[in-house]
């Protein structure tokens, strides 16, 4: 049988090393060889490259190699498949050596800032050594901060034949770190030179972007003073790198700039021991270049009432994500901030949080939680100045079973009952969160049976027990990933009950 | 339509010069390598020179190698064969001729007879 | 450096089928493409084979290209003979050692 006719032919000329082609089917049946016809200088020369019918057979791949390779040129190629009942050709296909060239990537030397030119890195690279002197070269810049997986790129040419080339890149952020590489191509060509070595460049320092802030309102102390925790970070958006020296606050009651008090830090929180009035406190860093612009925030009095609009909340899992949806009754609230923590017994050593704007949901990657660990999540409407009712929810990320099962006891033994109470595990023990608890219980060298019963049940009466028995009887606190057994207790019921008994001594 | 129309031939004397002209039309000259093809009365056709696109590169039949030259004007749309020293052996019609895209000729011109006697 | 080699002529009569060939003498003829040409007397040639057996869309489908590698030769063949089809036949390639093309010796058709 006759080979299939080769088809797919796609050609690639790579620039003065060589021209070549590829075509399907990549294997036969049968044992087949090719030969690859081409013209060349616009069709007056006419010559074959040939798959070698001895170690290359069924290789669906040509090349022709200088000195025959012109540039720039027309070729045609045409590929005969050839086996021992005869040959078929392809169709005549036609290449624009300008349009398939390929040349090697250049070569960036340096990435700069230019003193006193914001915002702006100064690439420099050599165009690369095997490029068409006179064609005009089309480049890609990627262009990525150091901590970001996310390219972003710009395209431009260049038409001077110049060794060193530049291209500034604006519109960048201050004090940042960023990985540039450059490709290019001649103009015409569909192909790309691969991507360069990768280089990195620093923008200019400026003065700091701006701050977050955020407040922890705590309960009055027995003096009327009400302890405050503000806190901040850098705002979105601002450079990784940028360093403040320090911070500038200054507070003051409502209407009264004149009780204005001030305090400079180097931390990102401070604590303020405000009165029971409206406050305004005001925040900005700094460093050697300037301030930053002012955060402002109202503490509200005491006695203010405020508003609340989330109606409810739910927080879910995604492979990778928590989500946390909640649903608003103020559809003119577009600005919320979410707090969470671990919700441990003692005070939480990490307090996290975060504004976000025109949505009404937050996510968060799930490799930033503790997995096996319970999270506070709080979520405050903010309408202009003022901050609304929290709405909380608890999630887990990850749930496990739990590290101990419940501490039991066995109270009230009858004749045929008994009243079994355990305690609640530990939150640092629960893992997730507990979905009900199952008593097992058995006679000795009897059937073991097992009652269920709901989270908030902590104590249960087991009925129908067989008087002057031995029991042996554990409690199991499950989650969602499964359950863990208490401490195994003993108990015997008694041969009749003390009610009479005591009736009995009396006679 | 294409069209290839050859000028300049006639009768010369053996050792004495003549430059032969073909005027281009209805095609982009500048993308095509150029020929000249001739044919001694009664025989077959004989190649005698072809020329790159942009003029750069000429290649010759022996026998007129070092004697003939051809050269082509892109602006002008025309192709040319100077022919020095000639002989009797180049008495013949001179077509001027087109290389195609796949290693033919496409087109011809009518042809332009050269005498070279005494 | 090779010669084509035609035979100086061929015959037939009406609507019957000729094949003329085209022998290379050195190296294999399907290192390089063939083209014919039609020349009739006193006129220009005409292209109606290229590329070994491509046909120009202006010429009739009774003309037709081949390659035989074991003959290693080249051939025209021409079907339905037609009056009109009398006329010389040359055969040409591309010879990279002279670095030019090379024309067959010419072959003339008779229609009986």
């Known amino acids: 049988v006759l080979p299939a006719k080769p088809e797919n032919i796609s050609c690639i000329f790579y620039y003065e090393e060589n021209f070549t082609c590829t075509w399907s089917p990549e294997k036969e049946a049968s044992y087949t060889w090719y030969k690859v016809k081409r013209t060349y200088s616009y069709g007056y020369k006419s010559d074959i490259c040939s798959t070698d019918n001895s170690t290359r057979g069924n290789h669906a791949s040509c090349s022709f190699l200088p000195p025959t390779i012109t540039n720039p040129d027309n070729y045609t190629i045409q590929v005969e498949a050839q086996n021992a009942d005869g040959i078929m050709k392809s169709d005549i296909t036609y290449w624009n050596l300008d349009a398939i060239m390929k040349i090697e990537p250049p070569e960036i030397f340096s990435v700069k800032s230019v003193l006193g030119i914001k915002r702006m890195l100064q690439i420099k690279w050599i165009r690369p050594v095997l490029a068409p002197h006179s064609s005009t070269l089309k480049y890609t810049l990627r262009f990525r901060t150091i901590n970001s997986a996310y390219w972003m790129e710009v395209n431009f040419t260049k038409e001077d034949i110049d060794r060193d080339e530049t291209y500034n890149l604006t519109e960048l952020q201050a004090f940042t770190e960023y990985v540039m590489t450059l490709r290019c191509a001649p103009a015409e060509s569909m192909f790309w030179s691969g991507w360069s070595q990768e280089k990195v460049g620093t923008t200019e320092e400026e003065a700091p972007y701006g701050l977050d802030l955020w407040r922890v309102l705590k309960p009055a102390m027995v003096d009327g003073r009400r302890p405050v925790q503000l806190m901040w970070k850098k705002a979105t958006g601002a450079p990784v790198l940028e360093k403040a020296l320090g911070y500038n606050i200054w507070y003051f009651p409502e209407n009264n700039t004149n009780l204005t008090e001030t305090v400079n830090t180097t931390n990102q929180t401070h604590e303020l021991y405000l009165g029971g009035k409206t406050y305004w406190v005001y925040v900005v860093s700094y460093n050697s270049l300037g301030e930053s612009p002012v955060a402002t925030l109202r503490i509200p009095a005491l006695n203010e009432k405020t508003f609340q609009c989330i109606e409810a909340m739910q927080a879910c899992l995604t492979q990778d994500q928590l989500v946390v949806e909640w649903q608003s009754s103020a559809p003119e609230v577009d600005t919320w901030m979410v707090e969470w923590f671990p919700d441990v017994d003692s005070e939480p050593s990490s307090f996290s949080w975060e504004s976000v704007s025109q949505a009404r949901n937050w996510t968060i990657q799930k490799d930033e939680l503790k997995p096996l660990w319970c999270y506070n999540i709080s979520v405050y409407p903010v309408l202009r100045d003022r901050v609304g009712q929290p709405y909380s929810t608890q999630a887990y990320v990850q749930e496990g079973i739990p590290s101990a099962g419940p501490v039991t006891q066995a109270d009230s033994i009858g004749v045929k009952t008994v009243t079994i109470t355990w305690k609640e595990i530990p939150k640092s023990k629960r893992n997730g969160f507990i979905k009900n608890y199952t008593i097992f219980y058995q006679a000795e060298d009897g059937k073991e049976f097992s009652k269920t019963v709901n989270s908030n049940i902590l104590q249960y009466r087991l009925e129908s027990l067989t008087r002057r028995t031995s029991y042996s009887l554990q409690v199991m606190a499950s989650t969602n990933a499964g359950g863990t057994n208490g401490t195994k207790i003993n108990f015997k019921t008694l041969s009749i009950s003390h009610h009479h008994h005591h009736h009995h001594h009396h006679h | 339509e294409v069209q290839l129309v050859e000028s300049g031939g006639g009768l010369v004397q053996p050792g004495r010069s003549m430059k032969l002209s073909c005027a281009a039309l209805?095609?982009?000259?500048?993308?095509?390598?150029m020929a000249w093809v001739r044919q001694a009365p009664t025989k077959g056709l004989e190649w005698v020179a072809s020329?790159?696109?942009?003029?750069?590169?000429?290649y010759y039949r022996d026998s007129v190698k070092g004697r003939f030259t051809i050269s082509r004007d892109n602006a002008k749309n025309t192709l040319y064969l100077q022919m020095d020293s000639l002989r009797s052996e180049d008495t013949a019609t001179y077509y001027c001729?087109?290389?195609?895209?796949?290693?033919?000729?496409?087109?011809w011109g009518q042809g332009v007879m050269v005498t070279v006697s005494s | 450096q090779f010669t084509l080699t035609q035979p100086k002529s061929v015959s037939g009569s009406l609507r019957s089928t000729i094949t003329i060939p085209c022998e290379r003498n050195?190296?294999?003829?399907?290192?390089?493409?063939v083209s014919w040409y039609q020349q009739h007397l006193g006129r220009p040639p005409i292209i109606v084979i290229y590329?070994?057996?491509?046909?120009p869309s202006e010429v009739s489908d009774r003309f037709s290209g081949s390659i035989d590698s074991s003959s290693n030769s080249a051939s025209l063949t021409i079907t339905n003979l037609q009056m009109d089809d009398e006329a010389d036949y040359f055969c040409?390639?591309?010879?990279?050692?002279?670095?030019?093309?090379?024309f067959g010796g010419g072959t003339k058709l008779t229609v009986l």
């Open positions: 590329a070994d057996d491509q046909r």
């Open positions: 020329i790159s696109t942009g003029g750069g590169n000429t």
């Open positions: 040409q390639s591309y010879d990279s050692n002279i670095d030019g093309p090379v």
């Open positions: 050195n190296g294999d003829i399907g290192d390089s493409y």
């Open positions: 209805g095609f982009t000259f500048s993308n095509y390598y």
């Open positions: 001729a087109r290389h195609g895209t796949i290693a033919a000729m496409d087109y």
